[in-house]
Interface confidence: medium
């Protein structure tokens, strides 16, 4: 036999145990709440924080860039590449043919505003990507200099000089005060680079990177 | 849809699940202890072995950790 | 961590979180189940009403929806 | 060897007109490179005024406005300086350089002219 | 227009020793890896001769104990060590913008 239990006893020890039970419950959803927001937020912010960041960047060059074609780039959703919409894409680049003659300075100043550069080729295949979009009776100039005027040649982003992979005219470069690169027609020898003058206004090839969002 | 999307509708209907069932498990065990207490009250003394019994049922269940 | 990362993670956390919880919930309710077979069997026809009226409440338990 | 010589009147009375001549020899002025015009006033600050180019083109300092001009003889390799309304500012000693193409730093000098302008 | 300020205005160094000048530019004076910024040596009753050119390189025939660095809006003119003939003022020039301007000058005295 058990000794029997008060009502008032037993009503207490119920609020009691019904107290810790919800208690539980609360403590438990609370974790769940905290779990499922962290999930949702902070990704969110963190990716909110990318988009910010990439705006910002888009904001800067928004007066130039109103808009922009962008692909998607890989199975994921968020995975868009884009380049401003008069731009070309090739690889991970956008290219800009620019009509407006200036000099290889002022040329490179108005790409840099831009966000981008005078165009640094590294490969032949980006060479033949780009003059497909050139005229054969204009030069554009490239991100190719030779400040100090003694052969030592430097592309405008810091990529390397490397004499395998230049495609100069047969001949060029020809003079030590020519400190510029440029990409014309030749007909007997089709496209290729050639040294000239910097201050002589040309056409110009910007080159940025892609935009990714 | 992508693959991040199809995961944080999982984690909502997860959530939710979460939420209800403990809600539902919470519910559930005061009613058992109130029917206990409730079974204890109504029998005449005869059964207090019973009575007590059922109360030792839902004193281990009280207890009990769930499995890790 | 990355983004789909965090996410998987914690579905991991819920879906367990639920796992363990239905089977609290199953056990629980087994348990309440097999309590009221036993009162039933044990009480001597008395008490029958008393017994019925427990089943009865498990009865509502079982049949009843979660909150909305 | 590139040489310049600077030439032109020491002494200039102030609203007149400057002219000075630089005579390059050891290069031609029509085969490349800017070919400027800088002076220095007495506390030693150093002012670029402008160039003429090798194809003609120039380009000249905003803070002189109109009155300045650089204009060229190409058979006789020279190029010229001429500032108009001068006044006792520009009393300073003028330079012609040759400046490189790119990345335009001024490589040959010639020995500069001294003028005062003074009534 | 760009404005170049050079310090100190005046320099007193021992023989041997490093001379050091400082030019600031008014805004960033480089184009990537290409740095505006020339040098130039002017000693009394001569025209100023180019040492440096775009930040670092050495105009042929300037000694080797002349080097420049620099990027931006900061450059520096270094001599190590410095030699009786060093005396002079030297300038620093920019081609990064029209119109090209210098700075004032410090004046290098040799103890």
């Known amino acids: 036999m058990v000794p029997e239990e008060e009502p008032q006893d037993r009503e207490k020890g119920l609020w009691w145990f019904q107290l810790k039970v919800w208690s539980m419950a609360v403590v438990s959803i609370l974790l769940l709440s905290v779990c499922f927001t962290v999930s949702s937020v902070v990704p969110h912010n963190f990716m909110y924080s990318k988009t910010v960041k990439r705006l910002s960047k888009l904001r800067e060059y928004q007066q130039y860039h109103p808009s922009l074609t962008c692909v998607m780039e890989g199975k994921d959703i968020e995975d868009w590449s884009c380049c401003p919409t008069p731009w070309t894409s090739f690889q991970s680049s956008c290219y800009f043919i620019s009509t407006g003659m200036q000099s290889w300075t002022k040329s490179q100043k108005n790409c840099s505003v831009m966000g981008a550069d005078l165009v640094v080729i590294n490969t032949r295949e980006e060479q033949d990507f780009i003059i497909q979009n050139l005229k054969r009776n204009s030069s554009y100039f490239l991100g190719l200099s030779d400040p100090g005027g003694r052969r030592h040649w430097q592309w405008v982003d810091q990529t390397p000089y490397n004499e395998n992979v230049t495609f100069w005219h047969s001949g060029e470069p020809n003079n030590l005060d020519e400190r510029c690169a440029i990409i014309n027609f030749r007909s007997s020898e089709e496209w290729g680079w050639n040294d000239i003058h910097c201050h002589v206004p040309q056409k110009s090839i910007c080159k940025m990177k892609k935009i990714y969002i | 849809l992508g693959e991040p999307q199809l995961c944080y509708i999982l984690d909502a209907i997860l959530f939710l699940y979460g939420i209800v069932l403990t809600l539902l498990y919470c519910r559930l065990k005061i009613q058992v202890r109130k029917a206990a207490i409730t079974s204890y009250e109504k029998s005449d003394g005869v059964y207090t072995g019973l009575s007590t019994r059922n109360q030792e049922t839902y004193e281990t269940l009280k207890h009990e950790k769930p499995p890790q | 961590l990355g983004e789909p990362q965090l996410c998987y993670i914690l579905d991991a956390i819920l879906f367990l979180y639920g796992i363990v919880l239905t089977l609290l919930y199953c056990r629980l309710k087994i348990q309440v189940r097999k309590a009221a077979i036993t009162s039933y069997e044990k009480s001597d026809g008395v008490y029958t009403g008393l017994s019925t009226r427990n089943q009865e409440t498990y009865e509502t338990l079982k049949h009843e929806k979660p909150p909305q | 060897d590139v040489q310049l010589q600077e030439s032109g009147p020491g002494l200039v009375k102030p609203s007149q007109s400057l002219s000075l001549t630089c005579s390059v020899t050891?290069?031609?002025?029509?085969?490349?490179?800017?070919w400027n015009w800088i002076r220095q006033f007495p506390g030693n600050k150093l002012e670029w005024m402008g160039y003429i180019s090798f194809d003609g083109t120039y380009n000249y300092n905003p803070s002189l406005k109109d009155r300045f001009s650089i204009t060229r003889d190409t058979s006789k390799n020279q190029f010229f300086l001429k500032l108009n309304s001068v006044t006792t500012e520009d009393t300073a000693t003028y330079y012609c350089?040759?400046?490189?193409?790119?990345?335009?730093?001024?490589?040959?000098w010639g020995q500069g002219t001294s003028v005062t302008v003074s009534s | 227009d760009i404005v170049l300020t050079q310090s100190p205005a005046s320099l007193a160094v021992s023989l041997g020793q490093r001379a050091t000048i400082s030019c600031r530019a008014s805004?960033?004076?480089?184009?990537?890896?290409?740095?505006?910024i020339h040098w130039y040596q002017q000693k009394p009753g001569q025209p100023p001769k180019l040492l440096i050119y775009?930040?670092?390189n050495l105009e042929s025939g300037v000694p080797a104990r002349f080097s420049g660095s620099g990027s931006e809006t900061d450059f520096t003119l270094n001599i190590h060590p410095v030699e009786e003939e060093d005396a002079a003022t030297y300038f620093c020039q920019q081609s990064f913008e029209d119109p090209w301007t210098f700075g004032g000058g410090t004046k290098l005295e040799i103890k």
């Open positions: 050891g290069y031609s002025i029509t085969s490349g490179y800017y």
């Open positions: 350089a040759r400046g490189v193409d790119y990345p335009k730093a001024m490589d040959w």
């Open positions: 775009v930040a670092s």
């Open positions: 805004e960033s004076v480089s184009m990537h890896v290409t740095h505006l």
